[in-house]
Every structure is written in structure tokens, then in C-alpha cells.
Amino acid sequence: HNTTVFQGVAGQSLQVSCPYDSMKHWGRRKAWCRQLGEKGPCQRVVSTHNLWLLSFLRRWNGSTAITDDTLGGTLTITLRNLQPHDAGLYQCQSLHGSEADTLRKVLVEVLADPLDHRDAGDLWFPGESESFEDAHVEHSISRSLLEGEIPFPPTS
């Protein structure tokens, strides 16, 4: 699995999407877990509703929510009031029995508020091609641009 990077800003919300084959994963509950070290299990943060048919209902654990569009094949995780300690390596999982298939590996990056960040020399949002190996970047930040600011680079 390649790793997809989702960059968010401290204090804001971040939405992570994990697409999957809806037929292949039909009837399966989903989960969002965090990899706290190089070795060891992925620690469950939140999982979808116990009844698969109700997977569209948003479930919360603290500031993290999960909802599943089982027809469209998209699992969505929302991290509310993003903070530095939320940064880390996560997985979207499809559950079957005691097993779990990885749908997507996600690197959540929490950056300090860019409204204060006005230095052109800073590596704020590095270009994908020059800075990432086997990674896709999602800039999940929404705000209006300040005068004279350069928009975030587009993502593919």
C-alpha cells in the first residue's frame, strides 16, 4: 500500500477519505486505526456502526468521526479540532471476522496555522513530485487566501 498524506491545520477539521470497491467489501464494517510505532498492532480509534446497514450513521470517538457510504464505496473520517498530537500514521480498514484488510494507509500531518506563516522560504506545502516517494498528498485545508498569497499547489 502506498501512503496518502492528508495535511491539516491545527484547530481546524480534517476530512480523510478512503475509497474502496463496494462489491468486494459488501457487508463489511470499517475501522480507523493508528499505528503508534514501526512494530506492533494498529490501535483502533473508531469503527462504523455495529449494524452494517446503518454504516452511514456517523459514529464518534472523542474528536474523531467515521461514516461509510457503502454504495459509493467511500469511507470518510473526520478529525475535529485537529491538534499536533493527532499527527501520525493511520489505516482505513475493512473488517471481516477477526481479520482486517487495509483499504488505505494515511499519514495525517498537522501544521501550525498558516495564517501566521508568511515566510516564503519555509517548506510549507512542498511540491508532490519533488518531495514525495510513493505518496499522494491531499491538502484538506479550506480558507480564503490573503492578498498576495499563492494558492496551495494543486493535487492530482
Epitope: 498524506v5 499505528q35 501520525g88 500531518e109 512542498p126
Partner: antibody
Framework: EVQLQQSGPVLVKPGASVRMSCKPS????????MNWVKQSHGKSLEWIGS????????SYNQNFRGKATLTVDKSSSTAYMELNSLTSEDSAVYYC?????????????WGQGTLVTVSA | DVQLTQSPSFLTASPGETITINCRAS??????LAWYQEKPGKTNKLLIS???TLQSGIPSRFSGSGSGTDFTLTISSLEPEDFAMYYC?????????FGSGTKLEIK
């Protein structure tokens, strides 16, 4: 064994810039955040900022924006910090400190520090 | 910014004694607090993270407690090598901040 080797002490003139390095060993460089911390003589510690070597994404203490620039060179697995427009207030020991796995849940390993002296 | 008030600033004790160092945050930081030991000629050492999680290789005489705004580092049965400078640090929000330090000296 994890180690962070920092560049040697420097004496610089006011107004000049300095770039110091932090060369870690014993782990995968891109898996762990790198932080930089300032300690003025006889004073406490002050967090400057952190950089994610995997993406190059950085976050700064507002007190150091415009003063410090953090970069990494993945090819040599080295982290750098550049300080510009130096004044006597910038005379201090600067530490690099490794965060946790793709995060910053405490700084488990520290470099030995780089002493920067700003004097005419 | 989250201010960390560390007390006492200075502490004298004898080997074998138990001491406590306090760290108070200006707002709730949940469990996101670390404790460090600083000794001359050595690199800084992370003792405790997440308020109470003892780091690998750190002796069990070190313990941390607290959450929210009030935290404590306890060193029981002090050893000669424990006399050093101690700092608390929050990583709950940017910018990360440190306490002003506690110097533990031998009586």
C-alpha cells in the same frame, strides 16, 4: 542505537546567518519528526519548530518565524536549521530532538547541541 | 500559548528520599505532557510521556501522574545519578512549551 550528531560550535557576527546540521543514525530518518529547541545560557528550553522529513512540512513557533528555517535532505538523512539576521539574543545552544513515529508525542532522542555565539 | 509553571525551581534532597516536582498548565492539555532530565555532558533524556507513561529503559523509581492542568513527577528512593535538572513539556498544541525547570541538588 539512535544518535543525533550535531554540527560544531560557531562564532558569527551580528547580521550574519548560520546553518547548522543534525545527522541522525540508528533509525529510518523519514519515519520520525525532527524538532529544534533553543536554550539560552542558564535559561529554560524554547521550542523553535518541527519538520516532517517524509513530506518536508514544517511548523514553527511564531516567535521564530522569519528567524529560523527548517529543512531536510532526505538523500543524506540530515536535518538543517538556518538562523538569519543574527543578534546577541540568538546566542544560545540549539538542539535537534527526534519526535515520535510520524508525530510529536515527546522528544525521545536529543542531539548534543550546537553552540552559537553572536559577537562583533 | 500554553504556559507551564514548574515548582519548585530548586530542590535539595538526600539519596534514598522521595521527591515530587509539579507542573501546572495554564489551560487543559489532557494527558499530553512529557518530563525530561538534563545533565551536563549528556544528551537530554525523555523520562515520561503522555503524563504517566514510563519510557523504555527508565528506572521504575520515576513515575508521572496527572491530567488536564496539574501534573507531578515523582522520584522515589533517589539515586546519586538522579541529581539533575528536570523539565516538563506540553505537546497538546502549538507552540510546544517547556516549564522553567527544577534543579535537584544533593543535600
Amino acid at each position: 542505537e539512535v544518535q543525533l550528531q550535531q554540527s560544531g560550535p560557531v562564532l558569527v557576527k551580528p547580521g550574519a546567518s548560520v546553518r547548522m546540521s543534525c545527522k541522525p543514525s540508528g533509525y529510518t530518518f523519514t519515519d520520525y519528526y525532527m524538532n529544534w529547541v533553543k536554550q539560552s545560557h542558564g535559561k529554560s528550553l524554547e521550542w523553535i519548530g518541527s519538520i516532517n522529513p517524509y513530506t518536508g512540512g514544517s511548523s514553527y513557533n511564531q516567535n521564530f518565524r522569519g528567524k529560523a528555517t527548517l529543512t531536510v535532505d532526505k538523500s543524506s538523512s540530515t536535518a538543517y536549521m538556518e538562523l538569519n539576521s543574527l543578534t546577541s539574543e540568538d546566542s544560545a545552544v540549539y538542539y535537534c530532538a527526534r519526535g515520535s513515529y510520524y508525530s510529536n508525542l515527546g522528544f525521545a532522542y536529543w542531539g548534543q547541541g550546537t553552540l552559537v555565539t553572536v559577537s562583533a | 500559548d500554553v504556559q507551564l509553571t514548574q515548582s519548585p525551581s530548586f530542590l535539595t534532597a538526600s539519596p534514598g528520599e522521595t521527591i515530587t516536582i509539579n507542573c501546572r498548565a495554564s489551560k487543559s492539555i489532557s494527558k499530553y505532557l512529557a518530563w525530561y532530565q538534563e545533565k551536563p555532558g549528556k544528551t537530554n533524556k525523555l523520562l515520561i510521556s503522555s503524563g504517566s507513561t514510563l519510557q523504555s529503559g527508565i528506572p521504575s523509581r520515576f513515575s508521572g501522574s496527572g491530567s488536564g492542568t496539574d501534573f507531578t513527577l515523582t522520584i522515589s528512593s533517589l539515586e546519586p545519578e538522579d541529581f539533575a535538572m528536570y523539565y516538563c513539556q506540553q505537546y497538546s498544541e502549538y507552540p510546544f512549551t517547556f516549564g522553567s525547570g527544577t534543579k535537584l541538588e544533593i543535600k
